[in-house]
């Protein structure tokens, strides 16, 4: 079925929401004054070998649990991430974007990445897909 302008618009909005969530996480933790940043950087994330289509979001979905675990370290009184809620929201968006019709087996790169590299990769992915839709 060819995508309609309304479905394209919906996809774009969902990607923009995902992008904002990922940027919010990155901005919240990637601050040189963050006392826990060096320890957060000891956690390793799997990166997709290829991320050019919405189906590749399967690779992001599979890393959401480890992401939540690291975000549990990122809270402060003035920065309420509420990791469980945030990851749940991202999960809903990812599921809708990648679709559940086809089962895609994610292929990961050999090298693991830090949380900062991981977030930047998926931010770049989201921006790239959005640019093809607009």
């Amino acid at each position: 079925m060819a995508p309609t302008s309304s479905s394209t618009k919906k996809t774009q909005l969902q990607l923009e929401h995902l992008l904002l969530d990922l940027q919010m996480i990155l901005n919240g933790i990637n601050n040189y004054k963050n006392p826990k940043l060096t320890r957060m950087l000891t956690f390793k994330f799997y990166m997709p070998k290829k991320a050019t289509e919405l189906k590749h979001l399967q690779c992001l979905e599979e890393e959401l649990k480890p992401l939540e675990e690291v975000l549990n370290l990122a809270q402060s009184k003035n920065f309420h991430l509420r990791p469980r809620d945030l990851i749940s929201n991202i999960n809903v968006i990812v599921l809708e974007l990648k679709g559940s019709e086809t089962t895609f087996m994610c292929e990961y790169a050999d090298e693991t990445a830090t949380i900062v590299e991981f977030l930047n990769r998926w931010i770049t992915f989201s921006q790239s897909i959005i640019s093809t839709l607009t």
């Epitope: 004054k33 370290l73 809270q75």
Partner: antibody, heavy 121, light 111 residues
Framework: EVQLVQSGAEVKKPGESLKISCKGS????????IEWVRQMPGKGLEWMGV????????YYNEKFKGQVTISADKSISTAYLQWSSLKASDTAMYYC??????????????WGQGTTVTVSS | AIRLTQSPSSFSASTGDRVTITCKAS??????????LNWYQQKPGKAPKLLIY???NLESGVPSRFSGSGSGTDFTLTISSLQSEDFATYYC?????????FGGGTKVEIK
Amino acid sequence: EVQLVQSGAEVKKPGESLKISCKGSGYAFTNYLIEWVRQMPGKGLEWMGVINPGSGGTYYNEKFKGQVTISADKSISTAYLQWSSLKASDTAMYYCARWRGEGYYAYFDVWGQGTTVTVSS
Amino acid sequence: AIRLTQSPSSFSASTGDRVTITCKASQSVDYQGDSYLNWYQQKPGKAPKLLIYSASNLESGVPSRFSGSGSGTDFTLTISSLQSEDFATYYCQQSNEDPYTFGGGTKVEIK
């Protein structure tokens, strides 16, 4: 009971290698980072470095970078601190400790009993 | 690295005394409203034991006679009524910036 049990005292000669251990029990070992702290005779505490047993990721105090290696074997819930060539100045008590960093905090809540390392010719 | 200066470095006290130990940081150890300053007790031949975390939170199982206060660069550990088992060395630690650093220690001896 949550505990960290360290290997026994060591007496070594300068130039020798050494690997001491810290075994965690009573909790999910890969869910917490392990820190290493040095205490030279009659002195205070110095933080050396940290390891994430789940990923193997490490971070060192610049003072100890290149002097020691921190590693872990998650299959046996054990973290290690090792030297390739000991010096007399490495004589000290070495502690491992569990890092807690959820929420708004960051502290060492459980400590090993310590391993005494004596380096003398 | 952040330097922590404890005072006094040692002193004598009697059981029942109210004891106050101070820890001064070379720069603020606060981040977004939280103080990353902890207190530990160490007895001879033993490992340090956590007493207070985040400046004022009492670790589970630690007697309520221990309390902590302060923010920014100035912190205090107070023992409201010194008991015989409290004679030990006390260390403050900052966990706001790497490398984590400890104060030089304050030894509390029997008068």
